[in-house]
Interface confidence: low
Amino acid sequence: DSSKWVFEHPETLYAWEGACVWIPCTYRALDGDLESFILFHNPEYNKNTSKFDGTRLYESTKDGKVPSEQKRVQFLGDKNKNCTLSIHPVHLNDSGQLGLRMESKTEKWMERIHLNVSERPFPPHIQLPPEIQESQEVTLTCLLNFSCYGYPIQLQWLLEGVPMRQAAVTSTSLTIKSVFTRSELKFSPQWSHHGKIVTCQLQDADGKFLSNDTVQLNVKHTPKLEIKVTPSDAIVREGDSVTMTCEVSSSNPEYTTVSWLKDGTSLKKQNTFTLNLREVTKDQSGKYCCQVSNDVGPGRSEEVFLQVQYAPEPSTVQILHSPAVEGSQVEFLCMSLANPLPTNYTWYHNGKEMQGRTEEKVHIPKILPWHAGTYSCVAENILGTGQRGPGAELDVQYPPKKVTTVIQNPMPIREGDTVTLSCNYNSSNPSVTRYEWKPHGAWEEPSLGVLKIQNVGWDNTTIACAACNSWCSWASPVALNVQYAPRDVRVRKIKPLSEIHSGNSVSLQCDFSSSHPKEVQFFWEKNGRLLGKESQLNFDSISPEDAGSYSCWVNNSIGQTASKAWTLEVLYAPRRLRVSMSPGDQVMEGKSATLTCESDANPPVSHYTWFDWNNQSLPYHSQKLRLEPVKVQHSGAYWCQGTNSVGKGRSPLSTLTVYYSPETIGRR
């Protein structure tokens, strides 16, 4: 059953004398493996014998016998799916039909393949896109219906006989569907390639020529133009004539329209290949070109720059930058339309010519206030001198100048006065808008530049002001020199360094912290009595009577200041001791008698000792000696001794008389 055999292979294979042929082939015999294979050349079926007659190129049978010519023809297949064949070399008389006689255990099949062998290598075929336009990338394809593993070939591209430098991509196909070699070349043709010959050349492995195919390029392109001008340098003066001619060097397809453009804009009613400009004006200066169109699009010539020369036009000045800050750099640029360009410039400042300034630019590296004003210029070229334009204004800004702080008060200023200061300046640009004062006080700071200090303090030393526009300029500080009475007056003991004892040499100093003016007088006072007029009060030998409350006064031309009262304390041993008796120095027996030791001492007496008429100390140590009841035997002279930290003092004798009571006298 023939339907059981399925074959796939190229229908026809192409080669040439001496080359080789590789036949890719697959099959499927559904009833089992292949047992016999014979390759016939031009097989014919013999009805008598029920077999195929023809030249046997290859034979593979069950017993494995192989004909001797089978070295040229090789069966590269297998027993169940591959039926690939190779003939190497292939000859002209191999052309015709190849018959593959296949036999399995139960089935037989004859498969036919066409082989076309030419005498010489056949040419490849170049394929071009339907239309080629300049600068658009196209792919050129060269196709050859041949490929064989045993016979390497190459395809090379030539343009006008010269190898093309673009890299080509070569691919081969040896499949059951197709057998070919293909070369593809990507190429961006220019208008100049129009009409040129492209060749695809088939070569063997050694680069030997085998065959070729050629095509002529038809490159569609916009018109290619050349422009010519009279005069050739395109430099004229106002009133001259100019002629421009447009020539088409190439166009595919033919051109259809012509126009002229100036600075990219079409000139009306100019549709011929010649442009005549009569009595030109400077406005006609510019870039001219001609434009010619075809079906591809418009083509433009190179531009011709027509220069109509004229004397400089009235100039303007550009300032970089105004307003300018004092000390900064400023550049002035003289701008004047002229052709040819100005060769010389004259500069003016406030109408006066600036000497030595002949360039297009004037650079002032360090601007000062006097540079302010109007700047103008005049430009000059070979055709004449331009007019001076309106000029430009340079505004020079700077901080306030020569700022001073001025005291408006009559001098001297006294503590407590109201002081008025003003902030003055010489000049300022822009105007002064505010003022600042140092140090900052509790006073109000009006913006008018006048400062009022109510009740000025003795310690307001210096004041400085600043006048401010965009910047602040500070004046040097001014001294208020406020005058005031002596301050912080106090009494200070200079000697002795320790406590004052009676008899010591004592010095008191009248101190003060400051005084303005410095010239001062001193006064010492005790209990409202003037003691001295020096800064020191001296006692050669102090006595307890000198103790008391002392004050010193310091005065200057502004006023006088007193110290706080200072207490002078003199330490001395107990003195002026005496024994007083209560109720008296005569007491009746049985009554009570109190003896008191009175004394003057600083510090007070801390310890008392009592003595009798025999100078015998009594066992009593308080200030009072109480005798109760008093006896006659107590009569006699008593004295006391007082002790403090400085020393001791004793009293004179005081006599106590104790007399008998009437009862005692009655008993006797």
Partner: nanobody
Framework: QVQLVESGGGLVQAGDSLKLSCLAS????????MSWFRQAPGKEREFVAG????????HHADSVKGRFTISRDNAKSAVYLQMNSLQPEDTAVYFC??????????????WGQGTQVTVSS
């Protein structure tokens, strides 16, 4: 197409001289104001000198005045820069430029590729 090709650059000692040339092709040379610019590493391109279409007037940047001189030869489509008393701060790539207007801005119609000038101390 338009080409501006500079030459003449190289390595010199401070105080030496060099002459740069720029050959133009593909343009009507006499229709263009020709300039030299330079660009030092890490800095912007700056104007050095320029010359009018007929060879006058010429303009020079303040930094090169008295040391560099620009000139042109319209017959040879060439512009030159004679550089004397070269200083290390003149080290840069020097570019030739063709332009319609004579402003000293870094805008030009056509530029060259540049030539390196190195001045060692």
């Amino acid at each position: 197409q338009v080409q501006l090709v500079e030459s003449g650059g190289g390595l010199v000692q401070a105080g030496d001289s060099l002459k740069l040339s720029c050959l133009a092709s593909g343009i009507t040379f006499s229709s263009y104001y020709m300039s030299w610019f330079r660009q030092a590493p890490g800095k912007e391109r700056e104007f050095v000198a320029g010359v009018g279409r007929s060879g006058a007037p010429s303009h020079h940047a303040d930094s090169v005045k008295g040391r560099f001189t620009i000139s042109r030869d319209n017959a040879k489509s060439a512009v030159y820069l004679q550089m004397n008393s070269l200083q290390p701060e003149d080290t840069a790539v020097y570019f030739c430029a063709a332009k319609w207007m004579a402003a000293s801005t870094t805008v030009a119609d056509y530029w060259g590729q540049g030539t390196q000038v190195t001045v060692s101390s």
